[in-house]
Each structure stands twice: as structure tokens, then as C-alpha cells.
């Protein structure tokens, strides 16, 4: 058993049929010695008396808010949550496996630049009695500070018969060094509590590996005289790191016909303009990627050819 | 060139070669289809290779103030990786594929380090760990680890030379 926060405790249980469970001793936080009784949740049934209560925790029915009283007055509470371990593996019932970029990916994170700011998100089908707490650091043995906000519900989607909820959190490294080569990964830890079930999820990454620039901005076409060619120009996204002579991007320009089956013409360039042939009913799209490190491409910025 | 008097390197040549190094490092170990080597708490492994750290003066301001600190750090790293790529880790079993870009990568690391430090001028180089005879399965894993960290190292070096070529060239 360990303390998650004040008066909230997590009991780690091996979860299999007829498991013996875990013996837990609760102590009433009071100077009083006599006349103390214990109850669980809203029940008025007295579970025991005395300053300590010994319970055998085997299942969710044994978890909940234990309260010690004296003469009708509440003295203190202890909330017991369960963390299940099945076949030696901690349960992951609360969050959905996003399966990208690999199986057992529960947390996904992205950064728009090298400033040390990043966003993580996760999915669940649970809609109520759900709380999340997020902590982060750079490195684990001598951790350096990363500050995370509160997790918030950022999207709701309908998937078949199920509703899916997306939660996200923003974090910022306290003393970020955008130009340095990272040697220690960022660690993100999410505590999830659903009713009386506790689970924790972790992710470890370098900012450089989760970079995904915003799409190029101000995408414009300029027709070239007496030609089917156009000059496409764009600018670095506002959110990208500066100076651009140091934090450079490379770009992919694509001409795409109306039909998805039509052949796509693609040009790669380090410049912020390119000359392409504009076909009727086609559109021109541009996306960006770090020039020197193959992290994710941005989403496409697009304009119609007409 | 970064010669004893502290004069400038051939920024544009360094820019071109460092960008080529980035391309080669990624073709030697593409991200797709390979395992994730961002190991949990693998702080011991990270200590094995040189890193361009915050105080090394490789940021735009530091380069403007005095590029020599940064260039020396990059040079140390290039020599370190050049030695690793020429070691038993890459030359031993299992053999690299005949068309592997590791040979080119090795030569380009040497080329860039020579651009930064011509004969007759010596910066101190970082001590390379004494490499015990590694086992075949260890070599396979170490190749991936080395190439992954090399990708990160040459990305910073390429940014430095790109910025230098754009803002510090005479």
C-alpha cells in the first residue's frame, strides 16, 4: 500500500481467482484513543472499533472511503483504491490502446517546435467518475523540472456504438535548451482513477522525436506568363522555432487531381517557393518537416489550382 | 577552417557535408520498421557518447559570441563517431549489407572532421570507451543505438553549419 495523495491510498493486488489479497491496517488520524468506530462509504454498518482497523482487501467491494468516527463526529477519512496486477502485468483498463506507432501506446505526445513545450493526449470510453493527474520530468535518476497543466477533455467522438473521449495536457520544460542535443528523455506519468480503480501510464521520448511542425502558412500561387506553370510560395509557420537559418525546415509540394486515383506529382525543396504545373481542378499542397531530423511531417496546407 | 588562430571554418562546405551526413545517417537507420530505442531511464547509455550540450555554445547566440567552443565540441563528436563506425561493432559479425551506407557515413564523418581541423592543429578529443569484444547480438543492438544517437548529433551540427553559412560567413 502507498499514498497517492493526502488520505488516498493505493493497494496493489495480484488479481486471480481466490487470491489472498492484501492485509491493510488503517489508523485514525486523531489524538483520541477510545470510542472510535469505522464505516465504509455511505454505509452505517460499523466495521470495527479502535484507533486502528485491520482489513483484508481482496476485491473492489473492499475498497472505498473508510471513515473513523467518535460520537457521531467524523475524525478522518482514508480512501482506498485498487491497482490490479494480472499475470504479473498491471491492468490497463481505463485508457484505450492507440496502437500508433506501436501496440500498447496509451499516451501520444507532439511538439510544434523545440521550445520544450509539448502536448500529450489519450483516449478512453469512460465518461464519468474519472480523474487524471499528470507529472513529467527530464530524466529519471536526477530529474529536471517539467511543468504540466491539468488534463482536460479535448474531444468527443462516436466510434460505432461507443463514444470515445480524448483528454489532453500541455507541459513545458522549465529550463529548455532548444539548440542542445537531448541526451535524457522526457518522462511523462499519468495517474488515472476510475471509481475505485487506479492505473498509471508512462511515456518516454525526446522532444526531437515528437516534433510535428504546424503546416506552412500564407500558401500562395502566382501564375507564370504564357505557361501552365505556377510559382507556389509559402512561409514558415509562426509556431516554428527561430531563427530559421538555424532551425530550418524542408518542404514537400504536391499537385493532386480531383480524383484520389490520379497520379500525384511531388517536389521536395528547402526553399519557400517552387514552380509546378497546375492542372485543371487540381489542388496544390505543401507540408513541412525538420530539415535535419526525420520527425513527423506537418499536416498539408492546400490551395486550389483555379 | 578552425585553425589555431581561431579563424572561421569553411562554413558553406561544412554545411553541405553536414547535411549529407544527416541524409546518410537516416538512410543507414531509417526510423520506419525499427524498434524504438528511446529506452526508459537509459541514462547510462547516453553517457557513452558525446552530446552537444546547453553550455557548449552551439546556439545562435553562442556561435555569434565565439564559435570555437562549439566547433571543438562538434569535432570531438565527429572523431568519436568516426572511431565507433570503424570499430568491431560495425566491422564484425553480423556483416553489414553490401549496399549499406555506413561506409559512406564513416568517410563523411572523417571528411567533416578534417575540414574542421587541418593537419598540424590538435584539439583534445573525447576518450572513446574501451570497447570489449562485443557479441554478435550486442553489435546488432549497438549499431542501432549508435546510429540513432548519431542522427541527433549530426542534426545539431548541421543546424550550426547552416546558421554559420547564413550569418557568419565572411
Amino acid at each position: 500500500i502507498w499514498e497517492l495523495k493526502k488520505d488516498v491510498y493505493v493497494v496493489e493486488l495480484d488479481w486471480y481467482p481466490d487470491a489472498p489479497g492484501e492485509m491493510v491496517v488503517l489508523t485514525c488520524d486523531t489524538p483520541e484513543e477510545d470510542g472510535i468506530t469505522w464505516t465504509l462509504d455511505q454505509s452505517s454498518e460499523v466495521l470495527g472499533s479502535g484507533k486502528t482497523l485491520t482489513i483484508q482487501v481482496k476485491e473492489f467491494g473492499d475498497a472505498g472511503q473508510y471513515t473513523c468516527h467518535k460520537g457521531g463526529e467524523v475524525l478522518s477519512h482514508s480512501l482506498l483504491l485498487l491497482h490490479k496486477k494480472e499475470d504479473g502485468i498491471w491492468s490497463t483498463d481505463i485508457l484505450k490502446d492507440q496502437k500508433e506507432p506501436k501496440n500498447k501506446t496509451f499516451l501520444r505526445c507532439e511538439a510544434k517546435n523545440y521550445s520544450g513545450r509539448f502536448t500529450c493526449w489519450w483516449l478512453t470510453t469512460i465518461s464519468t467518475d474519472l480523474t487524471f493527474s499528470v507529472k513529467s520530468s527530464r530524466g529519471s535518476s536526477d530529474p529536471q523540472g517539467v511543468t504540466c497543466g491539468a488534463a482536460t477533455l479535448s474531444a468527443e467522438r462516436v466510434r460505432g456504438d461507443n463514444k470515445e473521449y480524448e483528454y489532453s495536457v500541455e507541459c513545458q520544460e522549465d529550463s529548455a535548451c532548444p539548440a542542445a542535443e537531448e541526451s535524457l528523455p522526457i518522462e511523462v506519468m499519468v495517474d488515472a482513477v476510475h471509481k475505485l480503480k487506479y492505473e498509471n501510464y508512462t511515456s518516454s521520448f525526446f522532444i526531437r522525436d515528437i516534433i510535428k511542425p504546424d503546416p506552412p502558412k500564407n500558401l500562395q500561387l502566382k501564375p507564370l506568363k504564357n505557361s501552365r506553370q505556377v510559382e507556389v510560395s509559402w512561409e514558415y509557420p509562426d509556431t516554428w522555432s527561430t531563427p530559421h537559418s538555424y532551425f530550418s525546415l524542408t518542404f514537400c509540394v504536391q499537385v493532386q487531381g480531383k480524383s484520389k486515383r490520379e497520379k500525384k506529382d511531388r517536389v521536395f525543396t528547402d526553399k519557400t517557393s517552387a514552380t509546378v504545373i497546375c492542372r485543371k481542378n487540381a489542388s496544390i499542397s505543401v507540408r513541412a518537416q525538420d530539415r535535419y531530423y526525420s520527425s513527423s511531417w506537418s499536416e498539408w496546407a492546400s490551395v486550389p489550382c483555379s | 577552417r578552425a585553425v589555431p588562430g581561431g579563424s572561421s571554418p569553411a562554413w558553406t562546405q561544412c554545411q553541405q557535408l553536414s547535411q549529407k551526413l544527416c541524409t546518410l545517417a537516416w538512410s543507414a537507420h531509417p526510423l520506419v520498421g525499427h524498434m524504438d530505442l528511446r529506452e526508459e531511464g537509459d541514462e547510462e547509455t547516453t553517457n557513452d557518447v558525446p552530446h552537444i550540450q546547453c553550455g557548449d555554445g552551439c546556439d545562435p547566440q553562442g556561435l555569434r559570441d565565439n564559435s570555437q567552443f562549439c566547433l571543438q565540441r562538434i569535432h570531438q563528436g565527429l572523431i568519436f563517431y568516426e572511431k565507433l563506425l570503424g570499430s568491431d561493432i560495425f566491422t564484425g559479425e553480423p556483416s553489414l549489407l553490401p549496399d549499406s551506407p555506413v561506409g559512406q557515413l564513416h568517410a563523411s564523418l572523417l571528411g567533416l572532421s578534417q575540414l574542421l581541423q587541418p593537419e598540424g592543429h590538435h584539439w583534445e578529443t573525447q576518450q572513446i570507451p574501451s570497447l570489449s569484444p562485443s557479441q554478435p547480438w550486442q553489435r546488432l543492438l549497438l549499431r542501432f543505438k549508435i546510429l540513432r544517437s548519431l542522427q541527433a548529433f549530426v542534426a545539431v551540427a548541421a543546424r550550426v553549419f547552416a546558421h554559420g553559412a547564413a550569418t557568419l560567413s565572411p
Epitope: - | 524498434m35 547510462e44 557513452d48 557518447v49 553480423p94 574501451s130 570489449s132 562485443s134 546488432l140
Partner: antibody, heavy 121, light 115 residues
Framework: QVQLVESGGGVVQPGRSLRLSCAAS????????MHWVRQAPGKGLEWLSV????????YYADSVKGRFTISRDNSKNTLYLQMNSLRAEDTAVYYC??????????????WGQGTLVTVSS | QAVLTQPSSLSASPGASASLTCTLR?????????IYWYQQKPGSPPQYLLR?????????GSGVPSRFSGSKDASANAGILLISGLQSEDEADYYC?????????FGGGTKLTVL
């Protein structure tokens, strides 16, 4: 929290087969070489086999070569040891171990609790 | 002849030092090998302690007290695990290990008794 949990041990007759499993959690399984090591009752450690991170390289101790086969399923985060033609001298606690591979040396940093295999008629 | 030979047992008093040796078979030069040491207590799996090749090439396991240290005796072709300021919890089996010929090789182990 790195964890290795062996299973599949038990009592088996000489000449029969057994398959041991080692379920890994709390780390990126596909980034590590994995090993099997055994310990006969009251005796020392005996290394048995290794498999590379991607399963492409396997080596065995002479005592089990041709009888035991190591394998892994990275999608299931599981290591296996298929043991055929078992002998009384194969009676031991079987451990799976994770190898931490670094430039400056490689060692077993995490071990399972072991599973007991008893070969007896 | 075994690749690595360890004395089967060793006794020492609390507070004293214990020197556990691991002798390499002749023809295998201790100078070229990193020697790894593991501690095993009854009913538990082994735990990594440290590795030693030279004073400039050594590494302490995570959380392993500095009372545990490695060295070599080139004349005896042996690796040494030195435990200073012996404590009752140091009573355990100790194994040396090397990587040799595409295999991991363990010594036979030394049972250390703290009297």
C-alpha cells in the same frame, strides 16, 4: 516498473517436452536482447541461451544445443524456451533475464523470479 | 577445466573485508575481459553488483553501495570482488561472469558467510 514473469514450469517425465514463457512489462521489450539462465537445486547459475532484440540471432550453451529453442514474440512482449528431450539433469529453476547493452559493457539488469522445472519419472 | 573458477565458500566477520576471487582458465587473459559480479540471496534471483576491467573502465550497479568494488590480480589471472565493512545482509552467493565465445559464462559461485 520493469517486470519479468516466467511461467510454464512443472513436473515432466524424461524425454518429454515443456515450453516456458517469460512475460515482460514496463519497458520496450523489442529494444533488448533476452536470455535464459538456470540453477539446479543447491547449485550455481548456468547460462543457457540468448536471443537478439529482433530475434535474428540465437546462441545456446553446449548442454542444451539441439534440444532447446529460444524464441520471442515482440508483439506480445514474451520470450519463450521450448525444451525437448528433457533429462533429469535439466531439473532447475529457470530464469529469464534482460540484457542491458551499452558501449561500455553489457550485463543482466533485470531477472524474473524463476519457474521450477522438475524432470522425474 | 572450467572457464571461471571461484572458491566454493568464504567466511568473514562483520566489519571486516572479504576478497572473493574469480580465476580465469589459462589461455584466457584476465586483462582483456570485463568481469561482472552478481549477488544472490536465498529464494531470490541474482542481482547485478558491478563490472570491472580497469580503474578507468568500471561501473557500479544502480543502488549498489561503494563498499562493493572490483579489481584484478594479473599475476593470478583473476578478477576480485572486494567487500569492505561487511554487514550481515552481505551474506549471500556471489557469481562472477564474462562474455566469452558468443556466450555468457558464470563462475561456480562463492557462498559468503558473515560470522
Amino acid at each position: 516498473q520493469v517486470q519479468l514473469v516466467e511461467s510454464g514450469g512443472g513436473v515432466v517425465q524424461p524425454g518429454r517436452s515443456l515450453r516456458l514463457s517469460c512475460a515482460a512489462s514496463g519497458f520496450t521489450f523489442s529494444s533488448y536482447a533476452m536470455h535464459w539462465v538456470r540453477q539446479a537445486p543447491g547449485k550455481g547459475l548456468e547460462w543457457l541461451s540468448v536471443i537478439s532484440h529482433d530475434g535474428s540471432i540465437k546462441y545456446y550453451a553446449d548442454s542444451v544445443k539441439g534440444r532447446f529453442t529460444i524464441s520471442r514474440d515482440n508483439s506480445k512482449n514474451t520470450l519463450y524456451l521450448q525444451m525437448n528431450s528433457l533429462r533429469a539433469e535439466d531439473t532447475a529453476v529457470y530464469y529469464c533475464a534482460r540484457e542491458r547493452t551499452t558501449l561500455s559493457g553489457s550485463y543482466f539488469d533485470y531477472w524474473g523470479q524463476g519457474t521450477l522445472v522438475t524432470v522425474s519419472s | 577445466q572450467a572457464v571461471l573458477t571461484q572458491p566454493s565458500s568464504l567466511s568473514a566477520s562483520p566489519g571486516a573485508s572479504a576478497s572473493l576471487t574469480c580465476t580465469l582458465r589459462s589461455g584466457i587473459n584476465v586483462g582483456t575481459y570485463r568481469i561482472y559480479w552478481y549477488q544472490q540471496k536465498p529464494g531470490s534471483p541474482p542481482q547485478y553488483l558491478l563490472r570491472y576491467k580497469s580503474d578507468s573502465d568500471k561501473q557500479q550497479g544502480s543502488g549498489v553501495p561503494s563498499r562493493f568494488s572490483g579489481s584484478k590480480d594479473a599475476s593470478a589471472n583473476a578478477g576480485i570482488l572486494l567487500i569492505s565493512g561487511l554487514q550481515s545482509e552481505d551474506e549471500a552467493d556471489y557469481y562472477c561472469m564474462i562474455w566469452h565465445s558468443s556466450a555468457s559464462v558464470f563462475g561456480g559461485g562463492t557462498k559468503l558467510t558473515v560470522l
